[in-house]
Amino acid sequence: HHHHHHASQPCPYPMAPPNGHLSPVQAKYILKDSFSIFCEPGYELLQGHLPLKSFAAVCQKDGSWDQPMPSCSIVDCGPPDDLPSGRVEYITGPEVTTYKAVIQYSCEETFYTMKVNDGKYVCEADGFWTSSKGERSPPVCEPVCGLSARTTGGRIYGGQKAKPGDFPWQVLILGGSTAAGALLYDNWVLTAAHAIYEQKHDASSLDIRLGALKRLSPHYTQAWAEAVFIHEGYTHDAGFDNDIALIKLNNKVVINSNITPICLPRKEAESFMRTDDIGTASGWGLTQRGLLARNLMYVDIPIVDHQKCTAAYEKPPYSGGSVTANMLCAGLESGGKDSCRGDAGGALVFLDNETQRWFVGGIVSWGSMNCGEAGQYGVYTKVINYIPWIKNIISNF
């Protein structure tokens, strides 16, 4: 740093800015001598509003520094990102966004829950709001799934009328024939592949309605499809194996007591779906009168032993092998309670006794020609077999 040059005059003695220090410290600075400024943690080098990573000034021949002195300003993380379906609270003080300031994100109560972290973020020295786990991006408010106004736990045949909030995941799909689906998260619909197969290349033609109770009611939330994903193992007109599809909505829907997603089954869910456990199917499909229901209907039906169901569909007019391991059956041996045409794609749901949340165990798929027939059962896509497929699509799209 010392380049003594008799003809040059020393530069003015540099004074470090507040919250900064100067290095090296010398008695005087002459031609080609230099100094750097370093800021304390939580402070950043600025020239006006412009940030600098480092600063060094060199003493020139005319006795002036080649750079003006920067300032060390407290790091300001700026206003935190908004949280969809949530809010942010300033803990340190109103609108305080500088180094060490704390904010708390929270989600709208009842219908949303925070994913990823506890929502507490601190303005760190690098200028980013950071969670205790080191995440820089804000948390996510995920819809709470499986909430229902029902206190007890499709082709709806022999059922009863649903009340508001009983099946808030129920989706009415029009655009081809009447079908159903179940809301997952706030922008996906789970349905049967056969129900939307004709629209697979024309997603925008699907008319998707949420929060409706009466099939023809004008009171519903409209949604439109952005994309349709039909299981690659499903073959149209060749049985109903892999009868499962996902619809991505082009916008997130607002969750409330009438529009709430259904939960996907946990690993432990099979313990609530054993033979004779009760599931609930809902829909606007054909009723005992042979007409599409005006009001959303539901029916509580027990799960049927898989071998018993397989045997029931081995007799003509059915061909052997119709019922696969990717299906589950539900209904009464005596008949009279079933899902029916128009219910396809709807969810067969079960109550998880541990979480007290409803989850989708089956998707209304197919059944006997005459709904509710004795000795025949409704056949549902076994959702638990498709959790990796569902999660893969949702995480990638």
Epitope: Q47, G48, H49, L50, K53, P68, G78, D126, G127, F128
Partner: antibody, heavy 114, light 107 residues
């Protein structure tokens, strides 16, 4: 020698989003400084839009705050301007520049028209 | 916002003259002011930063002065290649703001 080069679509329809790229050569955008987007309207008026700093932090003109985002790809030494819901008022020449303006790109002309 | 006002939109000068372009800030901007030269069809070129520091490669006939709210760019011994538009910029606070420009013309 430090060089900046803007690239973009040239023509965008109203209500669409705009994305412009600034490719920097001769200096790493993570080494130091603020990396700015500035635009110039037909009457020569210049408007600073925002910057992304060497650390990745950003600062935006409050008049554009709801529509603007500046991001970067450090592996390609590029930074980007994203502007949503464009209108004919966004028709301008867009420049990228370093620090206080010691280096500028040549500019890319954007027309917003249906 | 700090509004930067260049009250003279046009200035006439002759080769060899000395000319001063002024810029007034609506708020105190310290010395965080830069000056740019722009010729038709080109991007602006940085001349002065921090009110009085000449950018590398800029001829020493260009000098900047001022602090607080009043700033001046002086060109001594004007050359024909100096005929261009000159802008000031404050980078003291968000948003950074430019002056409206002053066009330097030949008499």
């Amino acid at each position: 020698d430090v060089q900046l080069q803007e690239s973009g679509p040239g023509l965008v329809k109203p209500s669409q989003s705009l994305s412009l790229t600034c490719t920097v050569t001769g200096y790493s955008i993570t080494s130091d400084y603020a990396w700015n987007w500035i635009r110039q309207f037909s009457g020569d008026k210049l408007e600073w839009m925002g910057y992304i700093s060497y650390s990745g932090s950003t600062s935006y003109n409050p008049s554009l705050k709801s529509r603007i985002s500046i991001t970067r790809d450090t592996s390609k030494n590029q930074f980007f301007l994203h502007l949503s819901s464009v209108t004919t008022e966004d028709t301008a020449t867009y420049f990228c520049a370093r620090y206080w303006g010691d280096y500028w790109g040549h500019g890319t002309t954007l027309t917003v028209s249906s | 916002d700090s509004v930067m006002t260049q009250s003279q939109k046009f200035m006439s000068t002759s080769v060899g003259d000395r000319v001063s372009v002024t810029c007034k800030a609506s708020h105190n901007v310290g010395t965080n002011v830069a000056w740019f030269q722009q010729k038709p069809g080109q991007s602006p070129k940085g001349l002065i930063y921090s009110a009085s520091y000449r950018s590398s490669g800029v001829p020493d006939r260009f000098t900047g002065s001022g602090s607080g709210t009043d700033f001046t760019l002086t060109i001594s011994n004007v050359q024909s290649e100096d005929l261009a538009e000159y802008f000031c910029l404050q980078y003291n606070s968000n948003p950074l703001t430019f002056g409206g420009g002053t066009k330097l013309e030949v008499k």
